[in-house]
Amino acid sequence: ALDTNYCFRNLEENCCVRPLYIDFRQDLGWKWVHEPKGYYANFCSGPCPYLRSADTTHSTVLGLYNTLNPEASASPCCVPQDLEPLTILYYVGRTPKVEQLSNMVVKSCKCS
C-alpha cells in the first residue's frame, strides 16, 4: 500500500504520500486554533506508471496507454486514498470547543 508506513521509509519516486507539516498560525493565519499548533496534512505526488496502485479499470487503461504512448499527456494522477480526521481545540470567548474535522490527514495515495 502507498501509505505513510511504506512511503515515509522509502525513497520512492513514483506516486506516494509525502510528509507536509502545516502550522495553523504561520502557514494559514488561523491564530485562533489553540491545539494543535499544527499537524501533518501530507500530500500525494509522483508519477503513476502502469499498474501502480491503480484505482479503477480506467486508471489501469490510462496507465497502459501512457506507457505505450510516452509522448501522450494523458496519465493517471496521484491522489489521496485514505484520509483521517483531526481534532482541534479552540475557544469561543473563554469556553473551550473541541471539533473533529474530517478528511484532514492523508494516510495513503492511489493512482486514479
Epitope: G29, K31, W32, Y91, V92, G93, E99, L101
Partner: antibody
Framework: EVQLVQSGAEVKKPGASVKVSCKTS????????MNWVRQAPGAGLDWMGQ????????NYNEMFEGRVTLTADTSTSTAYMELSSLRAGDIAVYYC??????????????WGQGTLVTVSS | DIVMTQTPPSLSVSPRETASISCRAS??????????MHWYLQKPGQSPQLLIY???NLESGVSDRFSGSGSGTDFTLRISRVEANDTGVYYC?????????FGQGTKLELK
C-alpha cells in the same frame, strides 16, 4: 480592497424564512470567521452568530432560539444567513461582518452594507 | 451574558472640545493579559466601523484623535478635538464571553 456586498431588502410574511447573502472579495474567505449582527429600527446591535467558512464550523447566540442557520460557499466566497419562523420582532437590518482574525469571537473589522428585512402580513 | 452599559446615552459637544464615553461590563472582560473590549462608530445611514481594538489599540486608518483606555469592567473612549464627521452612535463590544455583546450605544452630536 476588502468588500462585503449583501443581497437586497426583503419583505416576508410572518412564519416565513429569509435568506440573506454576503458576497466577499479582496481577502482570503477561508481565513476569517464571518459574523452576523442585526439591528432593529432605532435600536442597538445584536450578535447572531458566526461561521468559519473553511469547514463550516458555527457558533450561535442562544437568543435566536435555533431559528438562525449560517452557511458558506467557498467556491463563490459567499456567506449566508437564514432566519426562520419570522415575526414582527425580526424587522431589522442584518449585517455580515468579518472577524478580526486573532480569536474565534473577536472584533469585526469589515462590515457589509446591511440588508433590511421587513415582516408584514 | 455580559451586559455592557454605556454612559451617557447621548451627549452634545462643541467642535474642538473633547468627548468621553464610558462603558461598564457586568463582569470583567480581561483574560490572558488582554482586555477584550472594542469600540465602533456608526455614522448615520452607514454600517458600524471599528475604531479601537482590545481596549486601546487604534485601528488602521482611524484618526489618532480617538483613544481608548480601561481594564476589567470599566472602559473609556475619548475623542479629542471633536469634528462634525465624528457624529453618530458609538458602541462598545466585548468578546471575552460567549455570546459576544454590545453596549446600547451613545449618540454624539455637535452643538
Amino acid at each position: 480592497e476588502v468588500q462585503l456586498v449583501q443581497s437586497g431588502a426583503e419583505v416576508k410574511k410572518p412564519g416565513a424564512s429569509v435568506k440573506v447573502s454576503c458576497k466577499t472579495s479582496g481577502y482570503t474567505f477561508m481565513k476569517y470567521w464571518m459574523n452576523w449582527v442585526r439591528q432593529a429600527p432605532g435600536a442597538g446591535l445584536d450578535w447572531m452568530g458566526q461561521i468559519f467558512p473553511a469547514w463550516g464550523s458555527t457558533n450561535y447566540n442562544e437568543m435566536f432560539e435555533g431559528r438562525v442557520t449560517l452557511t458558506a460557499d467557498t467556491s463563490t466566497s459567499t456567506a449566508y444567513m437564514e432566519l426562520s419562523s419570522l415575526r414582527a420582532g425580526d424587522i431589522a437590518v442584518y449585517y455580515c461582518a468579518r472577524g478580526y482574525g486573532n480569536y474565534a469571537l473577536d472584533a469585526m473589522d469589515y462590515w457589509g452594507q446591511g440588508t433590511l428585512v421587513t415582516v408584514s402580513s | 451574558d455580559i451586559v455592557m452599559t454605556q454612559t451617557p446615552p447621548s451627549l452634545s459637544v462643541s467642535p474642538r472640545e473633547t468627548a468621553s464615553i464610558s462603558c461598564r461590563a457586568s463582569e470583567s472582560v480581561d483574560s490572558y493579559g488582554n482586555s477584550f473590549m472594542h469600540w465602533y462608530l456608526q455614522k448615520p445611514g452607514q454600517s458600524p466601523q471599528l475604531l479601537i481594538y482590545l481596549a486601546s489599540n487604534l485601528e488602521s486608518g482611524v484618526s489618532d484623535r480617538f483613544s481608548g483606555s480601561g481594564s476589567g469592567t470599566d472602559f473609556t473612549l475619548r475623542i479629542s478635538r471633536v469634528e462634525a464627521n465624528d457624529t453618530g452612535v458609538y458602541y462598545c463590544q466585548q468578546n471575552n464571553e460567549d455570546p459576544l455583546t454590545f453596549g446600547q450605544g451613545t449618540k454624539l452630536e455637535l452643538k
